[in-house]
């Protein structure tokens, strides 16, 4: 038998520095976790102790902190090279800055193969990108060879900015011929490495003949065998074993997100390349693991530019941006409108002629807006200002909800109105009217939503049975501020871009902003 150790990360999202336990900014260093310096220590320790080790990343290194805002992917290439990753799969966020924003900083600079079998380039891009990413790569490991095939969420055109010259095919359809090709090359140990979410990972394990192991990402799935070491609740055992349609046992793994854990999977192959055992667990990268001094020094060197960036002007406001709790928790506030407009603008994707955009709606808990911005400072808006407004380091995500769920959410928004609670919703692409004289749970008297399947957007009454796309903070998607109905009833959830980054990009694009209070949220006569 031959043993392989697979070390894996996914959805690191720009967490190059150590973070707090909840993956936000590190405050108390003695209790911080993750970061590339600490990751390197653990990886090196395992490389020294074990003979056949692969370090793999399942995508979404891009997007998530000021590191990505400033360095735009150069930081990913630099530090992944330093850690000597063996392969990476493309995630949807790798396309956030367009194809150019992937090619120049990452594809051209990475010293490791970057993979995706289901992305096909066409037109002028085909020759430009040729060879910069691959469908698969055969890697020598010890005396053996291991094939790695990549895959990426076919939803990427709705989640990012890959442009019109990349076609995202069905993962299973695209993977099978590549795996077959590897088999004809006498490669009998094959890992599918990709970024389509846990459900698709399991489907690949079930349906793609010849795949021995699936290493996934996108859904931030935490798997663990035994008592979990931190706050994450396991979605299943690690590894998660799927029986394939042809009767093989295929381990499927993922390692949560944000570099908090290092996935650690030991696979035993027999002489024919069959997986005869697998075991392991994600390793919590807590402060008991020291940060590697040379990587840490490099991080500190790269950090300098970030501190300078924080105080640079992004754009100007010529109006007071009212982010006060007295406004945003009680009524429509122009800071809420600004943020929602930025959220929609960040999700403009013209992927279908029938739709002016795939999503038109935004909801945002008023309690998530933590500060106003005064225009009397020469109108200047900096990253630092925005970090005060949105200090939690969240993301603005895309969900699919039924109209009935949205109606429940808006009832929850005002179920205890008047107590300055955070659940009062700010909106975009929505007109809501509340009657506070009615009993809680029955206060929404009008709820109109902006059409998407239209050439001239207009507001139509919400339909209870229709499925709508909505942009909202990850906090709400996870049921925060009591929005349990969103968490319980959402039909799809894709994590999006860093909240501050979304707003800063919008302000930089607009140059001068002047958001108004314009009647998105109204109260019917006599009740307010």
């Amino acid at each position: 038998a031959w043993e392989l150790t697979i070390l894996h990360t996914n959805d690191v999202h720009s967490r190059l520095e150590q973070t707090s336990e909840d993956s936000s900014k590190c405050v108390n260093a003695s209790r911080c976790m993750g970061g590339v310096a600490r990751l390197f220590t653990k990886v090196q320790q395992i490389r020294r102790a074990e003979p056949n080790v692969l370090l793999l990343d399942a995508g979404d290194q891009y997007q998530g902190t000021i590191w990505f805002t400033v360095y735009k992917g150069a930081e990913v290439a630099h530090f992944m090279n330093a850690l000597r990753y063996d392969a990476m799969a493309l995630g949807n966020h790798e396309f956030d800055n367009g194809v150019e924003g992937l090619i120049e900083p990452l594809l051209k600079e990475a010293k490791f193969p970057i993979l995706s079998a289901n992305i096909k380039a066409k037109g002028p891009l085909a020759s430009q990108i040729s060879g910069l990413y691959l469908p698969y790569k055969v890697l020598p490991v010890g005396d053996e060879v291991v094939g790695i095939v990549g895959y990426t969420s076919k939803e990427t055109p709705f989640l990012s900015n890959p442009g019109t010259n990349l076609v995202f095919e069905d993962e299973i359809t695209a993977l099978q011929p590549e795996v077959d090709k590897l088999k004809t090359l006498n490669v009998n140990k094959i890992i599918a490495l990709g970024h389509s979410g846990f459900e698709m990972d399991k489907l690949i394990a079930q349906k793609v003949r010849g795949v021995d192991v699936v290493v996934g990402g996108h859904s931030n799935t935490f798997l663990y065998t035994g008592n979990p070491p931190s706050k994450e609740v396991p979605a299943g055992k690690y590894p998660f074993i799927v029986t394939s349609d042809d009767g093989r046992k295929v381990p499927v793994v993922q390692a949560y997100a944000f570099g908090k854990y290092l996935g650690y999977l030991k696979i035993e192959f027999d002489e024919r390349g069959n997986v005869i055992s697998s075991h392991g667990n994600p390793i919590l990268l807590n402060s008991s693991i020291p940060e590697d001094p040379s990587i840490k020094a490099d991080i500190n060197k790269w950090r300098i530019k970030l501190d300078n960036y924080s105080t640079q002007e992004l754009g100007k406001t010529i109006v007071y941006l009212d982010g006060s709790s007295q406004s945003c928790r009680f009524r429509e506030c122009n800071m809420g409108n600004l943020i929602c407009d930025a959220m929609i603008n960040n999700n403009l994707r013209h992927t279908d002629e029938m739709f002016w955009n795939h999503v038109s709606m935004c909801i945002l808990n008023g309690g998530g807006i933590r500060s106003p911005i005064d225009e009397r400072n020469n109108g200047t808006i900096t990253w630092e200002n925005l970090a005060a407004v949105l200090p939690f380091g969240g993301t603005f995500d895309l969900v699919q909800l039924k109209g009935s769920t949205l109606k429940k959410a808006f009832e929850h928004s005002v179920h205890r109105y008047g107590q300055s609670t955070g659940e009062f919703l700010q909106v975009g692409g929505i007109h809501v009217v509340y009657d506070l004289s009615r009993k809680p749970g029955d206060r929404v008297v009008k709820l109109d939503v902006l059409c998407t399947k239209c050439r001239v957007p207009s507001y139509d009454p919400l339909k209870m049975d229709e499925v709508y796309k909505v942009i909202l903070p990850n906090f709400l998607a996870n049921g925060g501020d009591g929005f349990q109905m969103i968490k319980d009833e959402l039909l799809r959830h894709d994590s999006g871009d860093q909240d501050i980054n979304v707003v800063s990009t919008y302000i930089s694009k607009m140059k001068v902003i002047y958001p108004a209070v314009e009647g998105r949220i109204k109260f019917s006569t006599g009740s307010h």
Epitope: Q206, I241, T243, G247, V275, I276, S277
Partner: antibody, heavy 118, light 107 residues
Framework: QVQLVQSGAEVKKPGASVKVSCKAS????????IYWVKQRPGQRLEWIGW????????KYNEKFKGRSTLTADKSASTAYMELSSLRSEDTAVYYC???????????WGQGTLVTVSS | DIQMTQSPSSLSASVGDRVTITCKAS??????VAWYQQKPGKAPKLLIY???TRHTGVPSRFSGSGSGTDFTLTISSLQPEDFATYYC?????????FGQGTKLEIK
Amino acid sequence: QVQLVQSGAEVKKPGASVKVSCKASGYTFTNYYIYWVKQRPGQRLEWIGWIYPGNLNIKYNEKFKGRSTLTADKSASTAYMELSSLRSEDTAVYYCARDDNYAWFAYWGQGTLVTVSS
Amino acid sequence: DIQMTQSPSSLSASVGDRVTITCKASQDVSTAVAWYQQKPGKAPKLLIYWTNTRHTGVPSRFSGSGSGTDFTLTISSLQPEDFATYYCQQHYSTPFTFGQGTKLEIK
């Protein structure tokens, strides 16, 4: 410890249907596959199919497709196998079994004898 | 479907004997073979999978070997509780198939 407890013996007439249950305990029901196996008196074992209660992924042996239906009730931690249009050759002991990572039929129920007789 | 053929169909032996049961697959099944023990009126019990991996709690006197199409189950020193019927099974591809069984009786 892992236990699979099957329903009691059944006597059915040809053309009727029978539903055999398999109640699981001692582990998380949704984490493992349940397999069904047929054994006619003095004959070899035959694999009927599997169900994965976690996402209700079901696979049948082509030979048993059509007349057998596998289901699972997560809340009751119970798997079921229904056989319809019974005939005399369906007289057999039916077993449910659970896998264990790299072992397929690792833990077995005690078996349910189904007798088809007019 | 892959056919699994066991030999012998029955076998008489004494306590302390070394016994070998063979199983032949109709096509290459790599090392994907399991062995089960069944006593009258009872459910089968898994002994070995992946040709030579003993299941939890199975005594070390049971061992397996082989590759491709030819496999053997060996009981190094028969104990009274080992008299039963033994089945091989291929888990190389669906449909999973079993051998016809080898009945091990007391001489």
